[in-house]
Interface confidence: low
């Protein structure tokens, strides 16, 4: 019976129950993989979770997650909320990015801002909670009345 | 009909371990429905615990409890556990296994429940 | 996560009156909610599932209505039998109860 069963195909299932030894899988399940002796059932994705691919008797729904919320986890076990960037998500919810530190993800927490000293730099555009510092070349760089291309933006 | 019956609770110190089983019957545990944990301090409301997906092994678990407690299942004895390590005197309670109602990815509500299993945490 | 808040806490009512218990979420959870009632000592009795759909072998005196936010449990006549705890519990996003309301007897 073994060797029979190890015929079965994915999207089957080896049924001792019937003179066919294969079953397809019933509506709403699969297997993945041949000689299986039950077919999974089908993933649902509902709630805060979306389908990114469909259920097929041969591999199972892949889950996304609806707008306002991403994924985390492995196959997208759990969505987590999106924040705007410059905040970063915490138990109390949304909350905005401190001062020196910035997000530029919807997702994620709030980084310190490049500190462009330790390069040997100076800061070309000073840093937001959206946005890092951009850093230039350093003081010596710039030739006697130079000036930066670009003015440093207000820091907010 | 489903039929679900907790054992395993009991009187431990700070610190020590338990481990409760629900054994199901009229339903396989296989089956497309989510399993769940939930527990009742003495004179307080319900706090889901832990949940673990019919489809596979997904687990999912409350911060309170997250790296102190572990579900698991044994298939072939149809049979939900739940262990418990690390037990804090906050964590007396009984103890109800649950099936959810439907077989969404997070299972909507609970529609079986066992008669609850006491756990009591003291010294 | 996502709380739900119950109101009121406790309340007194009369067997044959009309009794009102409303959940709210701290976040939209569409119809994702369920209420339940519990009797001293005994497990937890799924009454309504996806806001306003009845379980089977519940009273027809219960009903559920509501959806993203604010949902209510309507009891339209109560029973000598109805009292006891009351809990709301969402599905949207992992599982929360709601802290439970007491109907007592007045």
């Known amino acids: 019976l073994q060797d029979l069963c190890s015929n079965c195909p994915a999207g089957t299932f080896c049924d001792n129950n019937r003179s066919q030894i294969c079953s397809p899988c019933p509506p709403n399940s699969f297997s993945s993989a041949g000689g299986q002796r039950t077919c999974d059932i089908c993933r649902q994705c509902k709630g805060v979770f979306k389908t990114r691919k469909e259920c097929s008797s041969t591999s199972n729904a892949e889950c996304d997650c609806i707008s306002g919320y991403h994924c985390l986890g492995a196959e997208c076990s759990m969505c987590e909320q999106d924040c705007k960037q410059g905040q970063e998500l915490t138990k109390k919810g949304c909350k905005d990015c401190c001062f020196g530190t910035f997000n530029d993800q919807k997702r994620g927490i709030c980084r310190p801002w490049t500190n462009c000293s330790l390069d040997g730099k100076s800061v070309l555009v000073n840093g937001t909670k959206e946005r890092d510092v951009v850093c230039g070349p350093s003081p010596a760089d710039l030739s006697p009345g130079a000036s930066s291309a670009t003015p440093p933006a207000p820091a907010r | 009909e489903v039929q679900l019956v907790e054992s395993g609770g009991g009187l431990v110190q700070p610190g020590g371990s338990l481990r409760l089983s629900c054994a199901a019957s009229g339903y396989s545990i296989t089956s497309g429905h989510y399993w769940a944990w939930i527990r009742q301090a003495p004179g307080k409301g319900l706090e889901w615990v832990s949940s673990i997906s019919g489809y596979g092994s997904t687990t999912y678990y409350a911060d309170s409890v997250k790296g102190r407690f572990t579900i698991s299942r044994d298939n072939s004895k149809n049979t939900l556990y739940l262990q418990l390590n690390s037990l804090r005197a906050e964590d007396t309670a009984v103890y109800y296994c649950?099936?959810?109602?439907?077989?969404?990815?997070?299972?909507?509500?609970?529609?079986?429940w066992g008669q609850g299993t006491l756990v009591t945490v003291s010294s | 996560d996502i709380q739900l808040t119950q109101s009121p806490s406790s309340l007194s009512a009369s067997v044959g009156d009309r009794v009102t218990i409303t959940c709210r979420a701290s976040?939209?959870?569409?119809?994702?909610l369920a209420w339940y009632q519990q009797k001293p000592g005994k497990a937890p009795k799924l009454l309504i599932y996806?806001?306003?759909n009845l379980e089977t072998g519940v009273p027809s005196r219960f009903s559920g209505s509501g959806s993203g936010t604010d949902f209510t449990l309507t009891i339209s006549s109560l029973q000598p039998e109805d009292f006891a705890t009351y809990y709301c519990q969402q599905g949207y996003y992992l599982w929360t109860f709601g802290q439970g309301t007491k109907v007592e007897i007045k």
């Open positions: 649950a099936r959810g109602g439907s077989d969404a990815v997070l299972g909507d509500w609970f529609a079986y």
């Open positions: 996806d806001a306003s």
């Open positions: 976040q939209g959870i569409g119809s994702f």
